[in-house]
Interface confidence: low
């Protein structure tokens, strides 16, 4: 293909005065074939503490799409298929690495990010505080 | 920490033919300040699926620790505090970003890796397969 | 090998409409996520609309949005970014391009088709 338009800001990749760069290589290596949570398992609906998973795009990241969950009930569901309100749904979270073009826009130049995101959702027995 | 030992084989950061490569400023940007998943929540103590977090280390990669959740039970704790087995503790899991030094030991190159790494856990309803 | 063909882009006025088209080939087209990419004149490279492989979803920059609309002809190994009401500020050289690593990271582009709102 022919070479990618170049931003004017972008930071010049011999630059040797750019603060704390290194190069990575883009060829990931995938461990896993199959990307998709909805796919990969059922858990979000077989779950006491359901969930629901929310397309979260960003272009000027990567991963560009990050599927949040988010907890379907404040409770969670008993053996009758009822919401116990005695116990809480309530999300995992994970912090990720994620890549954020910076200058924006660039093709080749990008900023370590960490974010937290929630993965699932968790049925706990709820914290009661007893006032005297 | 102490310098990386630098691997004669690395590329040259300045390398125009280094294949499919960008420039990544570590200076992370991380909007979360809790880092350590133990202290971040009791959730993994008090859920109906409890795990237990095991530190996975690797100095060839980046984030060079990874916490991750093994179930504790096969089943789910029950009202009584007892294990149900009628019901499955399943670990969520999570595609994440690592880096990944490429070559070895080498403090300025490397490849984007995805992992799958288990969360924390959630309990489900089994899947019941009737034989006929 | 891999081919992005784009065509379309002209001179328009202000309020105007253009169709661009990018024609695909060497490649399993209805595989991928494809993506329009402008540069105006003298600024940055600038993401401006995506498409899913099978045209479920579409994505916009906010600052064309409701009036650009990207669509896909699978069969025809076809990409297409409808615009209506250009402004001058839609001066820029359109890029087709296909995603594959890293969305804006891109494996191959086309040629690129100059389009210049002007009165």
């Known amino acids: 293909g022919i070479t990618i338009p170049r931003n004017p800001g972008c930071p010049n990749s011999e630059d040797k005065n750019f603060p704390r760069t290194v190069m990575v290589n883009l060829n990931i290596h995938n461990r896993n074939t199959n990307t998709n949570p909805k796919r990969s398992s059922d858990y979000y609906n077989r779950s006491t503490s359901p969930w629901n998973l929310h397309r979260n795009e960003d272009p000027e990241r990567y991963p560009s799409v990050i599927w949040e969950a988010k907890c379907r009930h404040l409770g969670c569901i008993n053996a009758d298929g009822n919401v116990d309100y005695h116990m809480n749904s309530v999300p995992i979270q994970q912090e990720i690495l994620v890549l954020r073009r910076e200058p924006p826009h660039c093709p080749n130049s990008f900023r370590l990010e960490k974010i937290l995101v929630s993965v699932g959702c968790t049925c706990v027995t709820p914290i009661v505080h007893h006032v005297a | 920490g102490i310098t990386i030992p630098r691997n004669p084989g690395c590329p040259n950061s300045e390398d125009k033919n280094f294949p499919r490569t960008v420039m990544v400023n570590l200076n992370i940007h991380n909007r979360n300040t809790n880092t350590n998943p133990k202290r971040s929540s009791d959730y993994y103590n008090r859920s109906t699926s409890p795990w237990n977090l095991h530190r996975n280390e690797d100095p060839e990669r980046y984030p060079s620790v990874i916490w991750e959740a093994k179930c504790r039970h096969l089943g789910c704790i029950n009202a009584d505090g007892n294990v149900d087995y009628h019901m499955n503790s399943v670990p969520i899991q999570q595609e994440i970003l690592v880096l990944r030094r490429e070559p070895p030991h080498c403090p300025n190159s490397f490849r984007l890796e995805k992992i799958l790494v288990s969360v924390g856990c959630t309990c489900v309803t089994p899947i019941v397969h009737h034989v006929a | 090998q891999v081919q992005l063909v784009e065509s379309g882009g002209g001179l328009v006025q202000p309020g105007g409409s253009l169709r661009l088209s990018c024609a695909a080939s060497?490649?399993?087209?209805?595989?991928?996520?494809m993506y329009w990419v402008r540069q105006a004149p003298g600024k940055g490279l600038e993401w401006v609309a995506k498409?899913?492989?099978?045209?479920?979803?579409?994505y916009y920059v906010d600052s064309v949005k409701g009036r650009f609309t990207i669509s896909r002809d699978n069969a025809k190994k076809s990409l297409y970014l409808q615009m209506n009401s250009l402004r001058a500020e839609d001066t820029a050289v359109y890029y087709c391009?296909?995603?594959?690593?890293?969305?804006?990271?891109?494996?191959?582009w086309g040629q690129g088709t100059l389009v210049t709102v002007s009165s």
């Open positions: 391009a296909k995603g594959e690593i890293l969305p804006l990271y891109f494996d191959y």
């Open positions: 060497g490649f399993t087209f209805s595989s991928y996520g």
């Open positions: 498409i899913e492989q099978d045209g479920s979803e579409e």
